[in-house]
């Protein structure tokens, strides 16, 4: 079936970083500069991407695949493959309209993006406050505060933080 | 293709005004949130200013509030930024970019950006 492919579709052998070219009588031609096919058996090259403006250049362009790019210091990737680039905050801010601003009280940002979110509520674990929160950084729960009672035979370690959130883009 | 190109940049004393310019092609302008962002000599970029779709909504770094005014004319592809009462720290190199739609991508997410036109204040 394969050659059968092939003696009807000449431009079936032609391999990825190359294309079919019409004008040659479908010879296989190389990717001209600044293009590139990732597949075998096109009869066009696709336009490589340009990483200008914000974006850096992450990988070149090479005749088999598209350029990479990502964000110049002070933003980070936004969507597929870094179709945008949106500016970082510093830790315990929250990008706005208006800018980078800071966490209002009682929530918190611990890294450069996404959203303020709440600190956690020790006391819906049973649990009370071992290390109040900031702008950068999620309350520390502690034992309850019955476990913290005279006469109380141990004491439970602090539970971890919970995990960072991530903001929906 | 899609392109912004600014200009409008120049020398002024402190105290002067400059009215920058940036126009868009290649696309559907009026769909865009649209920004100004600045580059002062051996500093990171900052955020200088956006506006929405229709020009209701405009947001400036604390630095410039009061002194810069963004506005657009989508009849035109343009938009513009009134620099007054300009200050030493105002010397940069600024450059427009294009924000989100608001719906498809985030507001503050750019993708397209102008070649910059420098800004020196100084007397």
């Known amino acids: 079936f394969e050659r059968t492919r092939s003696l009807q579709d000449p431009c079936s052998n032609c391999p990825a970083g190359t294309f079919c070219d019409n004008n040659r009588n479908q010879i296989c031609s190389p990717c001209p500069p600044n293009s590139f096919s990732s597949a075998g058996g096109q009869r066009t090259c696709d336009i490589c991407r340009q990483c200008k403006g914000v974006f850096r250049t992450r990988k070149e362009c090479s005749s088999t695949s598209n350029a990479e790019c990502d964000c110049t210091p002070g933003f980070h990737c936004l969507g597929a493959g870094c179709s945008m680039c949106e500016q970082d905050c510093k830790q315990g801010q929250e990008l706005t309209k208006k800018g980078c601003k800071d966490c209002c009280f009682g929530t918190f940002n611990d890294q450069k993006r996404g959203i303020c979110r709440p600190w956690t509520n020790c006391s819906l674990d049973g649990k009370s406050v071992l290390v109040n929160g900031t702008k950068e950084r999620d309350v520390v729960c502690g034992p309850s505060p019955a476990d913290l009672s005279p006469g109380a035979s141990s004491v439970t370690p602090p539970a971890p933080a919970r995990e960072p959130g991530h903001s929906p883009q | 293709e899609v392109q912004l190109v600014e200009s409008g940049g120049g020398l002024v004393q402190p105290g002067g005004s400059l009215r920058l310019s940036c126009v868009a092609s290649?696309?559907?302008?009026?769909?865009?949130?649209m920004m100004w962002f600045r580059q002062a000599p051996g500093k990171g970029l900052e955020w200088v200013a956006n506006?929405?779709?229709?020009?209701?909504?405009?947001y400036f770094v604390d630095s410039v509030e009061g002194r810069f005014t963004i506005s657009r004319d989508n009849a035109k592809n343009s938009l513009y930024l009134q620099m007054n009462s300009l200050r030493a720290e105002d010397t940069a190199v600024y450059y427009c970019?294009?924000?989100?739609?608001?719906?498809?991508?985030?507001?503050?997410?750019?993708?397209?950006w102008g070649q910059g036109t420098t800004v020196t204040v100084s007397s």
């Open positions: 290649g696309f559907t302008f009026s769909n865009y949130w």
């Open positions: 506006i929405n779709q229709d020009g209701s909504e405009k």
């Open positions: 970019a294009r924000g989100g739609d608001g719906y498809s991508s985030s507001h503050y997410g750019t993708d397209v």
